[in-house]
């Protein structure tokens, strides 16, 4: 980019309502002008949740986002929301690129910038750009949760970030599930944390001028074993028309490996229950949780005989859980019935 160039998204036309998240790299010192919506009805620009004022070095004005000269602290997430609603018209992240200087490629990058160059930016040791986002120092979570540590920083040259766990370099290679390092967001993400993840996590942010660090504490509560948990309301009572297809859904949560069965309640010799007090059932489907689509029972081309009570039964080494639902099968649609009840199938 030439020093005089601006970053522009598009002219201020009516926006698409399906804005994809974008990332734009902007050189230090570069002017920025982004548009969102028509000029007279332009959206409101927000940076990191705070609405931009119509005046100032960084301003949101008549649908435009204008930055006279991009600085490291201008990096971050910008949203444009439609006036009078929360519809996102633009969702983008501005990332600090190299500064706009006339230096040669072979010049020592640490050398002093020419102060007469209006686009130069003095070298600066790393600093925290959003310390308020780092206030939650202790993260105490149950096992299975996702944990995200952030150390948003800036500096010139743009600093690098690395992570330590309990004082040792941390790349997550020994961690089941690994880690996600999102350098543009200055973050470390660990999914499905386990007790062995507990410890002190240090972000170390460095550039040629200096370094800063910050410590987070992570405690992980081991889950006590329990029988499977079934999501409330599933499977759901369902009404279908003869000849249609039906899906019954059962959502199972279990730390220990669960085993799932789909049962249909049946009648034998006019009775629904045996002498032992347990209902008569027919096993329709059985599998472990990792089998594909075990949590869904498909009933194709249903007939009146398919009507009745269905149970999702889940068990693990600790115990059993089950929930039931009723399938009602209506005769084939006739014009009168359709007019009275336009929805042929519904879920209670």
């Amino acid at each position: 980019l030439e020093a005089s160039e601006e970053v522009e998204l598009e002219p201020c036309l009516a926006p698409s309502l399906e804005q994809q998240e974008q990332e734009l790299t902007v050189a230090l010192g570069q002017p920025v002008r982004l548009c969102c919506g028509r000029a007279e009805r332009g959206g409101h620009w927000y940076k990191e949740g705070s609405r931009l004022a119509p005046a100032g070095r960084v301003r949101g004005w008549r649908g435009r986002l204008e930055i006279a000269s991009f600085l490291p602290e201008d990096a971050g997430r910008y949203l444009c929301l439609a006036r009078g609603s929360m519809i996102v018209l633009q969702n983008l992240t501005l990332i600090t690129g190299d500064s706009l200087t006339s230096s040669n490629d072979d010049e020592d990058p640490k050398s002093h910038r020419d102060p007469s160059n209006r686009h130069s930016y003095p070298q600066q040791a790393p600093y925290w750009t959003h310390p308020q986002r780092m206030e939650k120092k202790l993260h105490a979570v149950p096992a299975g949760n996702t944990v995200k540590f952030r150390c948003p920083a800036a500096g010139n040259p743009t600093p690098t970030i690395r992570w330590l766990k309990d004082g040792q370099a941390f790349h997550g290679e020994n961690r089941i599930g690994g880690i996600r390092l999102r350098h543009q967001h200055w973050s470390l993400v660990m999914e499905s944390v386990v007790p062995s993840d507990r410890g002190t996590y240090t972000c170390l942010v460095e550039n040629a001028v200096g370094s800063i660090r910050y410590n987070y504490l992570l405690d992980v509560l081991e889950r006590s074993p329990h029988r499977p948990i079934l999501q409330a309301g599933l499977p759901a009572n369902t009404t279908a028309v003869v000849g249609s297809d039906v899906e019954l859904l059962c959502k199972v949560y279990s730390d220990a490996q669960p085993h799932i069965q789909w049962l249909k309640h049946i009648v034998i010799n006019g009775s629904s229950f045996g002498a032992d007090g347990f209902p008569y059932v027919q096993v329709l489907k059985t599998a472990d949780i990792n089998s594909s689509e075990v949590e869904v029972l498909y009933l194709r081309n249903v007939s009146a005989e398919d009507a009745g009570e269905y149970t999702c039964l889940a068990g693990n080494s600790i115990g059993l859980s089950y929930q039931s639902a009723w399938l009602t099968v209506l005769p084939e649609e006739d014009p009168t019935w359709t007019a009275a009840a336009p929805e042929a199938r519904y879920t209670d």
Partner: antibody, heavy 117, light 107 residues
Framework: EVQLVESGGGLVQPGGSLRLSCAAS????????MNWVRQAPGKGLEWVGM????????TLEQKFKDRFTISADTSKNTAYLQMNSLRAEDTAVYYC??????????WGQGTLVTVSS | DIQMTQSPSSLSASVGDRVTITCRTS??????LNWYQQKPGKAFKILIS???RLHSGVPSRFSGSGSGTDFTLTISSLQPEDFATYYC?????????FGQGTKVEIK
């Protein structure tokens, strides 16, 4: 065997200063958080703050931030609590305790600080 | 800050008695609750972490239970060496906070 030994307590006048020491042994001092907890006479326990000796990052309870500072000397395996502008209500037994993330697994015997004229 | 309310503040019991101490927090702390024992002239000792996990060397007559905001420390059969003061502490958020303590005395 992990041992924590506090020292430096005593009688000090209101407005005065005092520096408490906590000598640690029996474990790797640098990578465990060291906490200070105090107990006023007849009262419960109150967390003062903590330090990670490896980089001397400290976190202090809000009410102590303007008067107390925590530091550590890794060459001596010792943590310090510097208390300035002391008040009568700072009279307490001060304990250092090793932090294991969200709990305190080892404690010193405590050192008594009395602020009185 | 998370407030801790411990009760009773003191109790008298005899050897062999079952003793229960409760701790209530001002907000949900999941199971990040620890119990400590303080004896005169001795250092504090951690008894239970994460609501119910007994620390090594702690007798099995000590047990902990609860979740969310209500927690209990139980001594199933009080022994002479158990006469002491007990404190709960939350480890869910900074600043760490403690209960006011429960002194268990000989009846």
């Amino acid at each position: 065997e992990v041992q924590l030994v506090e020292s430096g307590g005593g009688l000090v006048q209101p407005g005065g200063s005092l520096r408490l020491s906590c000598a640690a042994s029996g474990y790797t001092f640098t990578n465990h958080w060291m906490n200070w907890v105090r107990q006023a006479p007849g009262k419960g326990l109150e967390w003062v703050g903590m330090i990670l000796p490896v980089d001397s990052e400290t976190t202090l309870e809000q009410k102590f931030k303007d008067r107390f500072t925590i530091s550590a000397d890794t060459s001596k395996n010792t943590a310090y609590l510097q208390m300035n502008s002391l008040r009568a209500e700072d009279t307490a037994v001060y304990y250092c305790t090793r932090g294991d993330i969200s709990l305190f697994d080892y404690w010193g015997q405590g050192t008594l600080v009395t602020v009185s004229s | 800050d998370i407030q801790m309310t411990q009760s009773p503040s003191s109790l008298s019991a005899s050897v062999g008695d079952r003793v229960t101490i409760t701790c209530r927090t001002s907000q949900d702390i999941s199971n990040f609750l620890n119990w400590y024992q303080q004896k005169p002239g001795k250092a504090f000792k951690i008894l239970i972490s994460y609501t119910s996990r007994l620390h090594s060397g702690v007798p099995s007559r000590f047990s902990g239970s609860g979740s969310g905001t209500d927690f209990t420390l139980t001594i199933s059969s009080l022994q002479p060496e158990d006469f002491a003061t007990y404190y709960c502490q939350q480890g869910n958020a900074l600043p760490y906070t403690f209960g006011q303590g429960t002194k268990v005395e000989i009846k």
